[in-house]
Interface confidence: low
């Protein structure tokens, strides 16, 4: 592989690494969305919530005279509970009513697939760098692109989950905004998907310069 191509690959891999960090951050944190009730009584409290793929946290926030509940960063009594994705026999008690389980299960499962693709891609990259097996960058690029697509699907599933929660009769929340974990997931999708496509482009063999050359005739890449 030429020096310029190697430089492009390294820059792309750096972008993909940033995407991996952002994807990991999005998956493990629970600030995808912040939900809040609109109206409150002066001198009481309001209950805001933030949630991710694995758990939801509600926070009892002291109120002032404003119409809104929050921000969520205000001090208050916090109560977190994990979604019971994989043990349906158990009740998730207080938070059973606050999320549409089928959505969070789907989003979490797709996120796991995304992490799986990231691990496979990273293994290919490590093997490629270690033994100069440049051809391994191609499957790596595809794995990263697939990981990005999985993150995108998770993002969309979570968007639907938030919409369902807001529209639900069972929940107090009628206002919402997407938070930093959601932003991390969106950025991860862009970096992983575009980075994967760019890596695929840079790792492909040089196209023949002349009409009479075939791919097989092209100079071997060092």
């Amino acid at each position: 592989m030429s020096q310029t191509k190697m430089l492009k690959v390294r820059v792309t891999l750096f972008c993909i690494l940033a995407g991996i960090v952002l994807a990991m951050t999005a998956v493990v944190t629970d600030h995808w969305a912040v939900l809040s009730p609109h109206m409150e009584h002066h001198n009481t409290t309001c209950e805001a919530a933030h949630f991710g793929l694995w758990r939801i946290c509600t926070k009892r926030i002291p109120m002032d005279d404003s119409k809104t509940c929050g921000p969520i960063t205000l001090p208050g009594e916090k109560n977190c509970s994990y979604f019971r994705h994989f043990n349906p026999g158990e009740s998730s008690e207080i938070f059973e009513f606050t999320t549409q389980k089928e959505y969070s299960i789907s989003a979490a499962a797709i996120a796991i697939f995304s992490l799986g693709f990231i691990i496979l891609g990273s293994l290919c990259v490590l093997l490629s760098l270690g033994k100069k097996r440049d051809y391994l960058l191609r499957p790596a690029s595809m794995f990263y692109a697939f990981a990005g697509l999985c993150i995108l699907v998770s993002v969309e599933v979570m968007r639907q989950s938030v919409k369902r929660m807001i529209d639900s009769e069972d929940t107090v929340w009628i206002e919402y905004y997407y938070s930093w974990s959601f932003a991390c997931a969106c950025a991860a999708f862009i970096l992983l998907f575009l980075g994967g496509l760019a890596l695929l482009l840079f790792s492909l063999p040089r196209m023949p310069r002349n009409p009479w050359e075939s791919c097989m005739d092209a100079e071997p890449e060092h």
């Epitope: 009730p37 609109h38 109206m39 409150e40 009584h41 009481t44 409290t45 309001c46 209950e47 009892r60 119409k67 009740s91 008690e93 207080i94 938070f95 059973e96 009513f97 009769e169 069972d170 107090v172 009628i174």
Partner: antibody, heavy 120, light 111 residues
Framework: QVQLVESGGGVVQPGRSLRLSCAAS????????MYWVRQTPGKGLEWVTV????????YYADSVKGRFTISRDNSKNTLFLQMNSLKTEDTAVYYC?????????????WGQGTMVTVSS | QSVLTQPPSVSGAPGQRVTISCTGS?????????VHWYQQLPGTAPRLLIS???NRPSGVPDRFSGSKSGTSASLAITGLQAEDEADYYC???????????FGGGTQLTVL
């Protein structure tokens, strides 16, 4: 001062209609969910219906679903309850109440109540 | 039959401590929804006594206190006074009914 004043109660025959009003003052009416709660003579309290601050969300008790309609006019600080196809079991004192937290919190302000008697 | 269960009546002598229980189920109090308490003096509208399980609105004496545990809640009144004679109601939200629910009410008699 913060207060709610109901009106529109009276004696009505079964199957007829009645419209209750609740005038709010002393607080920003347009930012709070509002309820109707009733109390049958000598009995306990029963939640009837709730409406969100903007009027977009409305929920009803099963006993009145399809017959009662809650609405509000934020420009006039007034809450309404349209009661159709009234039954004798709808006889009660009807209170309007202010919600402290949408469909989930306490009723922190109550009106004095208006009596509705459904009798033939 | 009320969704939340309260004793029909309790009584106590002046200065005594009385408690009123409110028992729900996994679809209301047990699901994590808050419990609120109301006092209704004879011939008047109910008034909020305890909100969000244990919060006293301004103007409510500190003789009144509330607590919640599991699927039940309780209202405690210490230093009972003659003017406390009233009906007391608990209220919560029930997810299966998609609305608020009340207890049947407890009549407190000061002996």
């Amino acid at each position: 001062q913060v207060q709610l004043v109901e009106s529109g109660g009276g004696v009505v025959q079964p199957g007829r209609s009645l419209r209750l009003s609740c005038a709010a003052s002393g607080f920003t009416f347009s930012t709070y969910g509002m309820y109707w709660v009733r109390q049958t003579p000598g009995k306990g309290l029963e939640w009837v219906t709730v409406i969100s601050f903007d009027g977009n969300k409305k929920y009803y008790a099963d006993s009145v679903k399809g017959r009662f309609t809650i609405s509000r006019d934020n420009s006039k600080n007034t809450l309404f309850l349209q009661m159709n196809s009234l039954k004798t079991e709808d006889t009660a004192v009807y209170y309007c109440a202010k919600s402290s937290n949408w469909n989930y919190g306490s009723f922190d302000i109550w009106g004095q109540g208006t009596m509705v008697t459904v009798s033939s | 039959q009320s969704v939340l269960t309260q004793p029909p009546s309790v009584s106590g002598a002046p200065g005594q401590r009385v408690t009123i229980s409110c028992t729900g189920s996994s679809s209301n109090i047990g699901a994590g929804y808050d419990v609120h308490w109301y006092q209704q003096l004879p011939g008047t509208a109910p008034r909020l006594l305890i909100s969000y399980n244990s919060n006293r609105p301004s103007g409510v004496p500190d003789r009144f206190s509330g607590s919640k545990s599991g699927t039940s809640a309780s209202l405690a009144i210490t230093g009972l006074q003659a003017e406390d004679e009233a009906d007391y109601y608990c209220q919560s939200y029930d997810r299966s009914l998609s609305g608020s629910v009340f207890g049947g009410g407890t009549q407190l008699t000061v002996l």
